[in-house]
């Protein structure tokens, strides 16, 4: 008894296609071993016709394929353009030889059944319209015209020229003549349904002098396109239903037994299971649209259908397109946190994976908005200006080649709660969805900057201090200057006398930044942050305003400023918190390059930007947020 299973008998007709599915036991060896389809000869030898190793016999060239679906433990042999010569005994099997595990399949291909000689075959998809052409002689020009459908020996009238219409064809069938034509009439049947298929007879006149035409109507159910996607990746359903439904509401639904449950439609309906990870995008004025779903889950696998109807719901007799989605659990896309938590005033660091083979691709971060079709405006990108309202509090850190980039958002408010997408202009499968949940803070932030109203005077020395709790003691502290192309970590003190410098007084848990001397271009947002290795953690931001020295203003020397910072109560600076670092994403230490690389990535993006002031601090607004 073979552990391989499939259809024992397959029957079809010439010209048709068959898809033979063979099932194998779910083991790692079976998933990866050679799959084959061979034809059993009289001598007992089974000649390979196609195999998963890429072999394709001459007689199958251009008309057959073998696809393995390891997540289903199946493989499918598709054979098109069948002829009667394909009738025979076959084996579908696994193994390096054709004597391994197999299943016997009998394929029978018959001749196309004979219709009356003058039968015209019409092949249409569900929901479409067929126009049946009926010819007649001049003698029947004024006679009754009709179309009937054969049911066994009987022929039931569908429509006739006396304006009779069968109730099941009401509002769907019309009988008409074109122009001055005296020898032909037409019957249109719209919104075709499967039960419309069959043999029709159109007739002009009565009795032996009547003119008759036979029409065979085939109504095709949509053949589902197979989509094979990885867990956590994304899928796009491209839907093209034709001009005739361009103005009707569109939908995507998921088949469930007899029904098809709407996931999204253009009337604003959306399934909560897809909240934050679905977009419906009209493509043109001809009714084309696409639906993108990100963050694919195992339970997303199944049969999907897109369609159009004024109700935004599936309706029999309206055009549809179908897919079957398989979700492969052996995904190349790493598992990242789907929910990130933060508190008001705090910050989050979100790691976005991307295809490591596409390190030069442009990276983006967008905010999913739940308008009627869903949309995701870009907030930040490697070559995109930070959106208004996010200046000074949002930065994207790219590390080419690492397979991930990090987005940091600080000065959080409850309005920041929602869904965000990580995406690139490269491999579209690598789109990930993150839900950000921002709760009201119940205690002071972990990082605090003094002075809080930071105004530096040109030509003087200016120091700001960042207080951190003991739990960050072992982590690296840094200051960086925010600009539209990221937050560039400031060089250490010995990298130039004029440069900003960073020093840390471990005894009082303060990291200070000194600008000496202050210049006009030093104005802007500065971030104080911590990182572990190259994994970014908590950040806080402060806007430093720069002004001219006014006559008579007191001159504070740098040591006084530092001393003032050190006057902060030590207990407060040392306060150790037991709160979980819940607002940090699961960050991978490999994801970040050194500071120089981050700087270079920013400079590179700067070169490509049209706007001249995008990266300069002087170009930033002076208002504090």
């Amino acid at each position: 008894q073979s552990p391989i299973f499939g259809p024992q008998d397959v029957s079809s007709i010439e010209g048709n296609s068959v898809s033979i599915t063979c099932y194998y036991p779910d083991t790692s060896v079976n998933r990866h071993t050679r799959k084959y389809w061979c034809r059993q000869g009289a001598n007992g030898y089974c000649a390979t016709l196609i195999s998963s190793n890429g072999y394709l016999s001459k007689e199958y060239s251009g008309r057959a394929s073998l696809i393995n679906f390891p997540e289903n433990s199946t493989f499918v042999i598709n054979i098109a353009h069948l002829t009667q010569e394909d009738t025979g005994s076959y084996k579908c099997g696994l193994g390096t030889t054709n004597r391994g595990l197999f299943f016997d399949v009998s394929l029978e291909v018959s001749q196309v059944p004979e219709f009356p000689n003058d039968t015209h075959v019409y092949t249409k998809d569900i929901g479409r319209t067929v126009t049946i052409e009926c010819r007649f002689k001049e003698g029947n020009a004024h006679s009754k015209k009709s179309l009937c459908k054969k049911r066994g020996e009987a022929c039931e009238v569908v429509i006739d020229s006396t304006e009779y219409v069968d109730p099941s064809y009401k509002d769907r069938a019309i009988l008409f003549m074109k122009g001055t034509s005296r020898d032909i009439f037409y019957v249109n049947i719209s919104h075709l349904i499967p039960s419309d298929a069959g043999l029709y007879v159109c007739q002009a006149g009565e009795g032996p002098s009547a003119d008759k035409n036979n029409a065979d109507l085939q109504v095709l159910e949509p053949e589902p396109e197979l989509l094979y996607k990885d867990l956590r990746s994304s899928v796009t359903f491209e839907c093209d239903l034709g001009r005739e439904v361009a103005n009707d509401a569109k939908y995507l639904c998921r088949k469930n037994k007899e029904t098809c449950d709407v996931i999204i439609n253009t009337l604003g309906k959306r399934d909560p299971a897809f909240e934050g990870r679905i977009l419906l995008t009209p493509r043109d004025d001809n009714g084309r649209f696409s639906v993108l779903i990100t963050g694919l889950r195992k339970e997303d696998a199944g049969h999907y259908q897109c369609g159009a109807h004024s109700s935004g719901l599936p309706q029999e007799g309206w055009p549809v397109q179908a897919w079957q989605l398989f979700v492969n659990e052996e995904s190349t896309i790493p598992n990242s946190r789907s929910v990130v938590k933060g508190v008001t005033g705090g910050s989050v660091a979100i790691v976005c994976p991307y295809n490591p083979k596409e390190s030069s691709s442009l990276k983006y971060w967008c905010h999913w908005e739940a308008d009627e079709n869903g949309r995701c405006p870009v907030l930040v990108g490697t070559q995109a200006l930070v959106q208004e309202g996010y200046e000074g509090r949002l930065a994207l850190f790219d590390q080419p080649g690492s397979g991930a980039y990090t987005v940091i958002l600080n000065q959080l408010t409850t309005q920041d709660s929602g869904f965000y997408w990580c995406l690139t202009d490269g491999d579209s499968r690598w789109r990930t969805t993150i839900e950000l949940q921002v709760a009201e803070a119940t205690k002071k932030p972990d990082l605090e900057v003094t002075p809080q109203n930071a105004t530096a005077v040109i030509g003087e020395t200016f120091t700001i201090s960042c207080h951190y709790p003991c739990k960050f003691y072992s982590q690296e502290k840094y200051w960086c200057k925010w600009s539209n192309d990221g937050c560039h970590i400031l060089p250490s003190h010995d990298e130039g006398a004029r440069q900003s410098s960073v020093s840390c007084d471990q005894s009082s848990q303060i990291v200070s930044m000194t600008l000496n001397p202050v210049k006009k271009e030093d104005e802007g947002w500065y971030w104080c942050g911590v990182k572990e290795g190259q994994v970014y953690g908590e950040t806080t931001a402060i806007y430093v305003a720069v002004e001219e020295r006014t006559r008579g203003s007191p001159h504070i020397n740098p040591t006084d400023a530092n001393a003032r910072a050190k006057d902060a109560p030590e207990e407060e600076a040392m306060e150790s918190s037991v709160r979980e670092d819940e607002n940090k994403a699961n960050l991978d230490p490999r994801l970040f390059a050194d500071e120089r690389e981050i700087q270079n990535a920013g400079d590179q993006a700067q070169e490509n930007r049209a706007s001249g002031n995008a990266g300069s601090a002087g170009g930033q607004s002076g208002s504090s947020k």
Epitope: F5, S17, I20, K257
Partner: nanobody
């Protein structure tokens, strides 16, 4: 909702034959868009796959049979009557069971032996094979 009604069961001697019928009704879809089949359950045992028939279109179909009954079964259907038949030959006492007609609109991509994939089940018809 699809209703399935089985008939044709009964008492038969070992070596004899039976033809089971299953009439389907209540669907807005064409009968050929369903996979139809049979499962059976012997006293104290799990329900097991017997046979299935899937139509891809009016002229292409796939017949599946359980290994244990291969060569003794023929599944067929009459689309005009919305009925599926199971011809069972050379019956053995171990074929004694309640035979259930099943249907699913899910198409070709599922293992027909997996009973979880069938959305509709009949009430069953008893087949008893005496020795």
């Amino acid at each position: 909702e699809v209703q399935l009604v089985e008939s044709g069961g009964g008492l038969v001697q070992a070596g004899g034959s039976l033809r089971l019928s299953c009439a389907a009704s209540g669907s807005g879809r064409t009968f050929t868009s369903y996979t139809m089949g049979w499962f059976r359950q012997a006293p104290g045992k799990e329900r097991e796959f017997v046979s299935a028939l899937t139509w891809a279109d009016d002229s292409t179909y796939y017949k599946y049979y359980a290994d244990s009954m291969k060569g003794r079964l023929t599944i067929s259907r009459d689309n005009a009557k919305n009925t599926v038949y199971l011809q069972m030959n050379s019956l053995k006492p171990e074929d004694t069971a309640v035979y259930y007609c099943v249907a699913t609109g899910r198409g070709l991509t599922y293992d027909p032996r997996d009973r979880r994939k069938y959305d509709y089940w009949g009430q069953g018809t008893q087949v008893t094979v005496s020795s």
